[in-house]
């Protein structure tokens, strides 16, 4: 690879912990997405919280290592946890620059493959590490 991996960086207010230390933030100004050069992997991640009416980004950044899923060219999220009733956390990993900016698609809540009501529960802001 000719370049270090660069990902979109975002952490929603109230999220506990930070993945900022997994890369070097680029000085992109105010109107552009924040960007981070990954230090320990060539892999980006994204986490979205899907409720009945909308998907809200929770975190975006660099993974701490390359692992299965990182070879994906695009962000194809899969369900990981239920932080609260009626919402589902979806995460993706991918291995191209800024691939975590957007997801290619999200299955509707409750669709096959989404964890059932017995899935892991977590308080807001505490679910992120489970998803990672």
């Amino acid at each position: 690879p000719p370049n270090r991996r660069t990902c979109v960086f975002f952490e929603a207010p109230g999220v506990r912990g930070s993945t900022k230390t997994l890369g070097e933030l680029l000085d992109t100004g105010t109107e552009l997405p924040r960007a981070i050069r990954c230090l320990y992997s060539r892999c980006c991640f994204g986490i979205w919280n899907l409720t009945q009416d909308r998907a809200q980004v929770e975190m975006q950044g660099c993974r701490d290592s390359d692992e299965p899923g990182c070879e994906s060219l695009h962000c194809d999220p899969s369900p990981r946890a239920h932080p609260s009733p009626g919402s589902t956390l979806f995460t993706c990993s991918c291995g191209t620059d800024f691939c975590n900016a957007n997801y290619s698609h999200l299955p509707p809540p409750g669709s096959p493959g989404t964890p059932g009501s017995q899935g892991p529960q977590a308080a807001p802001g505490e679910s992120i590490w489970m998803a990672l």
């Epitope: 000719p2 370049n3 270090r4 070097e24 552009l32 997405p33 960007a35 390359d66």
Partner: antibody
Framework: QVQLVQSGAEVVKPGASVKVSCKAS????????VSWVRQAPGQGLEWIGE????????NFNEKFKGRVTMTVDTSTSTAYMELRSLRSDDTAVYYC??????WGQGTLVTVSS | DVVMTQSPLSLPVTLGQPASISCRSS???????????LEWFQQRPGQSPRRLIY???NRFSGVPDRFSGSGSGTDFTLKISRVEAEDVGVYYC?????????FGQGTKLEIK
């Protein structure tokens, strides 16, 4: 095939600005970083910075910060590099390159009063 | 900034003979992701630079196999197994591990 075609030579006065263009073809413009490199007459190569066309994120050599602006027009697959407050030691051939694997032919910028 | 020091700066070679260029960096070029972002470029007289090698030892497409790269950490080498007339020009090493990216000062290869 991948091609990067740059604008023609420029002669500019000290203190003025110059904007060099780089038109890309033969690949998906938004999928690769465009870097800018310069070479003063008889000298080596110097990295100026890079821009990712899909979102406009750029990364600069601190030496040029405040004087250089990199932009893109994705509708025409063209990258631009503007250098301001030009001095005589900015006289150089300026190259654009697609992640350093394919290079433009270079644009000679001469700063002279 | 990371300083890239090449040697020799001038390299007279007989056609058909091997040639070797050394490049030493002031800091390790191995990045935290396990990759080493070290490249070699050739610039023939009057032409734009051309990438020969990336990632220390990977030949770019279309580059003859007489060119090879090796090294790790701070010490790197470009070798030409048998020099041909078309190899005349200036060779640069380049690092993209640290910002700002930096080039070596260049090695001028000429035919004896």
């Amino acid at each position: 095939q991948v091609q990067l075609v740059q604008s023609g030579a420029e002669v500019v006065k000290p203190g003025a600005s110059v904007k060099v263009s780089c038109k890309a073809s033969g690949y998906t413009f938004t999928d690769y970083w465009v870097s800018w490199v310069r070479q003063a007459p008889g000298q080596g190569l110097e990295w100026i910075g890079e821009i990712y066309p899909k979102n406009g994120v750029s990364n600069f050599n601190e030496k040029f910060k405040g004087r250089v602006t990199m932009t893109v027009d994705t509708s025409t697959s063209t990258a631009y590099m503007e250098l301001r407050s030009l001095r005589s030691d900015d006289t150089a051939v300026y190259y654009c390159t697609r992640q350093r694997d394919y290079w433009g032919q270079g644009t000679l910028v001469t700063v002279s009063s | 900034d990371v300083v890239m020091t090449q040697s020799p700066l001038s390299l007279p070679v007989t056609l058909g003979q091997p040639a070797s260029i050394s490049c030493r960096s002031s800091q390790s070029l191995e990045y935290g992701d396990g990759y080493t972002y070290l490249e070699w470029f050739q610039q023939r007289p009057g032409q734009s630079p051309r990438r020969l090698i990336y990632g220390v030892s990977n030949r770019f497409s279309g580059v003859p196999d007489r060119f090879s790269g090796s090294g790790s950490g701070t010490d790197f080498t470009l070798k030409i197994s048998r020099v041909e007339a078309e190899d005349v020009g200036v060779y640069y090493c380049f690092q993209a591990t640290h910002d700002p990216n930096t080039f070596g000062q260049g090695t001028k290869l000429e035919i004896k």
